[in-house]
C-alpha cells in the first residue's frame, strides 16, 4: 500500500538552487574519483553554449551501469523540458568527438561554475 496523503509538497526548487545542487554533485564526482570514472566510458562531447542541459543528458544517458553518475543523470533529466531516452540525439546536433566521462564532467562543471558566477540561472 502507498500512502499519498499527509505531506505538504515542497515548493519548486529555484533555478539558482537547482544549478548549485548540480554543481555540488559534479564537484562530488570529481573529488571522489579514484578508479577511472565509469570504467573509462566514452561519451559524445557537446557544445556547452547550445542547449547544453538536454545535450549533456543525451550524451550521459548512454552510459549505463555507472552508479557514480546516476544522480547527475536524474538531475539533468529535470533540467531538460523534453524526455530524453538512450540513443536520442535531438540536441546533440554535432557528434564528431568522443571524450571520457571524467573529462566530460570536468568540462561541464567548469562551464556551470562560470554560469553560476555570472548569475545565469536560466
Amino acid at each position: 500500500l502507498t500512502c499519498l496523503g499527509g505531506f505538504a509538497s515542497p515548493g519548486p526548487v529555484p533555478p539558482s538552487t537547482a544549478l548549485r545542487e548540480l554543481i555540488e554533485e559534479l564537484v562530488n564526482i570529481t573529488q571522489n574519483q579514484k578508479a577511472p570514472l565509469c570504467n573509462g566510458s566514452m561519451v559524445w562531447s557537446i557544445n556547452l553554449t547550445a542547449g547544453m542541459y538536454c545535450a549533456a543528458l543525451e550524451s550521459l544517458i548512454n552510459v549505463s551501469g555507472c552508479s557514480a553518475i546516476e544522480k547527475t543523470q536524474r538531475m539533468l533529466s529535470g533540467f531538460c523540458p523534453h524526455k530524453v531516452s538512450a540513443g536520442q540525439f535531438s540536441s546533440l546536433h554535432v557528434r564528431d568527438t568522443k571524450i571520457e566521462v571524467a573529462q566530460f564532467v570536468k568540462d561541464l562543471l567548469l562551464h556551470l561554475k562560470k554560469l553560476f558566477r555570472e548569475g545565469q540561472f536560466n
Epitope: 542547449g51 538536454c54 529535470g78 523540458p81 523534453h82 524526455k83 531516452s85 545565469q120 536560466n122
Partner: antibody
Amino acid sequence: EVQLVQSGAEVLKPGATVLISCKVSGYTFTDYYMHWVQQAPGKGLEWMGRIDPEDGETKYAPKFHDRVTITADTSTDTAYMELSSLRSEDTAVYYCTRYDYYGPFAYWGQGTLVTVSS
Amino acid sequence: QAVVTQEPSLTVSPGGTVTLTCRSSTGAVTTSNYANWFQQKPGQAPRTLIYGTNNRAPGVPARFSGSLLGGKAALTLSGAQPEDEAEYYCALWYINHFIFGTGTKVTVL
C-alpha cells in the same frame, strides 16, 4: 493519429477541488512528458506543470505548486490534473499538451472549461 | 520568479515584415531557455510555430522564423498574410519550469 481527449466542463464552488482527465491515444504514453497549461478568459497562457508518465516524476510552476497535483495512469493512458482550494480566479480553460523535442506542445487536448462561482 | 515580457501589440501591412521579441527579466535569453513560439486564434488551442529557439514546427510556413536578437528571443514574420492575425506567445524554460510570455496581438492591416 495522436489524440488527447479531456474531460468535460465543470462548474464548482470556491474551496472545491477539480480533477481533469486527459486520455491519450495514437502514441506510447510513457514516451513523452505531459504538460498542463491554464488560460483564464481573455488572458494569456500559464504553465502549470508536467509529468513523466513513466515514473510519475513531476515539475510544478511556483505559482501552482501548493494546489496542483499531476498524476498519470499508465494502465489507461490517462493523465490527470487536480487543482484544489479553487477560487474565482481559477476560472479558466485547462489544456493538457504533449511535449517532445521535435514537436513541443504540438498536440493539445480540446481544453476543459472550469468555472468557479458561488 | 522570472517575468517574460512581449510587446502588447504590433501592426504589420500585408506582405510586410514584423519582429516580435521575448525578454527575460533574469538576463539574456540563451539556447538553454529552449524558446518556443505559439500562435493562438480566438476559441482555438495554441499552435506551436517555433521550438528550441529557431526550429520551425512541422507544417509551419517558412515566413515564420525564430532567433536570438540582442539578448532576447525573436520571432520574425516575413511576408505577412491576413490569416497571420492572431495572438502570439513565447515560452522560456528556466532550468525546471516554463514561463509563458505576456503575449503580442499582431494585426495585419
